[in-house]
Interface confidence: low
């Protein structure tokens, strides 16, 4: 229904706390370089304005769209051009072009220092002095580094952060309490960030239809007892919500997400038997719980999929009369029977089925032609199953760090032109798939592995798109979203690459490495490994093992030495010489 004042409507629906959080996220995602203090000033101005509109919807400017109000605020920032260059050109445009322009300037890899967590005592002091400001900083810092983070979910993580600090800051050993809990929140949030970026990529590149297909498959797996009409309704709503968030309509997105949670909880009987525990929670937790809900039990009496989609003589007629709905039912029926498949795989199967019908329904004897389609699915199913098997075996053998290194070598060989920091980040994330998925029960492994890898590879594509350097990466990234992972898996050593010349300074290290946290140490070593592969793309596994083992020993030895600097200065060149020799 239409409201006189959109901003008053959202303020009333969301409440002041969530309204302010979402406005802060929106501004931080659009203008990623602005300091917190500047954004919070704008947030307060917008909030005060919203309150005047709640009091009187006919007050001046209250009838303006939220994009207009937000855009006007951003464009009024002094020195916008100095800080943001051509983003300031957006301000010359009218809505909706202005908002589109802002969206195009979102930077997936902003030049910001890594988010450093303050030391436990300092954190607790600032949290206890001003919890609102502390959590506001959290929202700001995460949102500006992840300009597509799903805003209502970020509010949920801020709530979690709040819970952890409230609990741990009263403990005697604050650090022991905080570190594992905040690490867990961070890990979940980082995965959420790449997953949401993938959803926005899907929406941006392939439109709502592609996203809705993804949603139908996912919902059908989770709610196999729901009827297709119900699944379609949920998928349509989820598509709308994600479109809003990806498009910067964060207030509407969060409001609609809360509405969907309400609808699901009011209609549990027709959706799933597993929802009740979620429905007792407050709004942010309820939505998050529903988004992570376990699959309902598959109905016992489902007939074979072949009856309707292969054996039926009317398949072509049904397909011709309503292609999208017919394919939607196929996707629904197949997905509800296969919670053990990844959504990417289910969409590939639906695509294969569609291609088969397109071909066969134009032939003389369609049933004979499409009669073997389910058997033709077999290689498509086997490929990701083998991927999971071989990678999980390798992970079990090497552990997370070793597995990351194996992936790093593999991907540096596939795309040696890609910058080393991007390759290291991608390999570290891809390597985490082992810890995340390989320990799960067999039936959950494939969906976990493939859908996670797809999201990480989407991040690689997004970064590569900014500065394209590898034709192979461009080719894999330009194709359909569901074909990306198989495309990357199929890449081999890039024979066209001219190896990088050996630069001693790339492999020169100093005593500062000794005081780095373990994670940073690993990144230094992995950076060296990627550079080695760029120098010798065809180096054998044994050669790389020898060099990296030698390197690890060198770091260990010099970090234990009395005169660290001297050790690095004298032993370093010897290491470089030995490495060159080993790789010759």
């Amino acid at each position: 229904e239409a409201h006189k004042s959109e901003i008053a409507h959202r303020f009333k629906d969301l409440g002041e706390q969530h309204f302010k959080g979402l406005v802060l996220i929106a501004f931080s995602q659009y203008l990623q370089k602005c300091p917190y203090e500047e954004h919070i000033k704008l947030v307060q101005e917008v909030t005060d304005f919203a309150k005047t509109c709640v009091a009187d919807e006919n007050a001046e400017n209250c009838d303006k769209s939220i994009h207009t109000l937000f855009g006007d605020k951003l464009c009024a920032i002094p020195k916008l051009r100095d800080n943001y260059g051509e983003l300031a050109d957006c301000c010359a445009k009218q809505e909706p072009e202005r908002n589109e322009c802002f969206l195009q300037h979102k930077d997936d890899n902003p030049n910001l220092p890594p988010f450093q967590r303050p030391e436990a005592e300092a954190m607790c002091t600032s949290f206890q002095e001003n919890p609102t400001s502390f959590l506001g900083h959290y929202l700001h810092e995460v949102a500006r580094r992840h300009p597509y983070f799903y805003a209502p979910e970020l509010l949920y993580y801020a709530e979690k952060y709040n819970e952890v600090l409230t609990q741990c800051c009263t403990e005697s050993d604050k650090a022991a309490c905080l570190t594992p809990k905040l690490d867990a929140v961070k890990e979940k949030a980082l995965v959420a960030a790449v997953r949401q970026r993938m959803k926005c990529s899907s929406m941006q590149r392939f439109g709502e239809r592609a996203f809705k297909a993804w949603a139908v498959a996912r919902m059908s797996q989770r709610f196999p007892n729901a009827e297709f009409a119900e699944i379609t309704k949920l998928a349509t709503d989820v598509t709308k919500i994600n479109k809003e968030c990806c498009h910067g309509d964060l207030l509407e997105c969060a409001d609609d997400r809360a509405e969907l949670a309400k609808y699901m909880c009011e209609n549990q009987a027709t959706i799933s038997s597993k929802l009740q525990a979620c429905c007792d929670k407050p709004v942010l937790q309820k939505s998050q719980c529903l988004a992570e809900i376990e699959h309902d039990n598959i109905p016992a009496d489902l007939p074979s999929i072949a009856a309707d989609f292969v054996e039926d003589k009317e398949v072509c007629k049904n397909y011709a009369e309503a292609k999208d709905v017919f394919l939607g039912t196929f996707l629904y029926e197949y997905s509800r029977r296969h919670p053990d498949y990844s959504v990417s795989l289910l969409l590939r199967l639906a695509k294969k089925y569609e291609a088969t019908l397109e071909k066969c329904c134009a032939e003389g004897d369609p049933p004979a032609c499409y009669g073997t389609v389910l058997a033709e699915f077999q290689p498509l199913v086997e490929e990701p199953k083998n991927l999971v098997k071989t990678n999980c075996e390798l992970y079990e053998k090497l552990g997370e760090y070793g597995f990351q290194n194996a992936v790093l070598v593999r991907y540096t060989q596939k795309a040696p032109q890609v910058s080393t920091p991007t390759l290291v980040e991608a390999a570290r994330n891809l390597g985490r798939v082992g810890t995340k998925c390989c320990t799960l029960p067999e039936a959950q492994r494939l969906p976990c592995v493939e859908d996670y890898l797809s999201a990480i590879l989407n991040r690689l594509c997004v970064l590569h798109e900014k500065t394209p350097v590898s034709e192979k990466v461009t080719k894999c990234c330009s194709g359909s979203l569901v074909e990306r992972r198989p495309c990357f898996s199929a890449l081999t050593v890039d024979e066209t690459y001219v190896p990088k010349e050996f630069k001693a300074e790339t492999f020169t290290f100093h005593s500062d490495i000794c005081t780095l946290p373990d994670k940073e140490k690993q990144i230094k070593k992995q950076t060296a490994l990627a550079e080695l592969v760029k120098h010798k793309p065809k180096a054998t596994e044994d050669q790389l093992k020898t060099v990296m083992g030698d390197f690890a020993q060198f770091v260990d030895k010099c970090c234990k030495a009395a005169d660290k600097d001297n050790c690095f200065a004298t032993e370093g060149p010897n290491l470089v010489a030995r490495s060159k020799e080993a790789l010759a």
Epitope: E227, D308, F309, D312, V325, G328, T329
Partner: nanobody, 126 residues
């Protein structure tokens, strides 16, 4: 569980019209794919027309296209079959069948419909 009850059959002259109704209970009719079938004496059950669940996409047998119209009234939870230009070969017992969880009539095979009404007789004769 879905219960179906047909009504509206009767004797009609060739060229005449009839409107059959199928009242459903136990489930909302718009959530289920529903269809009309007919069975002439000594013959198998034959698909006449169907409508999808949750999506108003209709299907017709070639022999009735342009003459029969299937529709439903969700508020009354009832399925209808408007039959015009009736012919003697339309004489049969008409049944409605339901397939819960099916958005489309992806099959015109009677065996795939788990729920049936008891049928209503339509006789077309001068």
């Amino acid at each position: 569980e879905v219960q179906l009850l047909e009504s509206g059959g009767g004797l009609v002259q060739p060229g005449g019209s009839l409107r059959l109704s199928c009242a459903a209970s136990g489930r909302y009719i718009d959530e289920t794919a529903v269809a009309w079938f007919r069975q002439a004496p000594g013959k198998g059950r034959e698909f006449v027309a169907g409508i999808g669940g949750g999506v108003d996409i209709t299907y017709y047998a070639d022999s009735v296209k342009g003459r029969f119209t299937i529709s439903r009234d969700n508020s009354k939870n009832t399925l209808y079959l408007q039959m015009n230009s009736l012919r003697p070969e339309d004489t049969a017992v008409y049944y409605c069948g339901a397939r819960p969880g099916r958005p489309l009539i992806t099959s015109k095979v009677a065996d795939l419909y788990p729920y049936w009404g008891q049928g209503t007789l339509v006789t077309v004769s001068s």
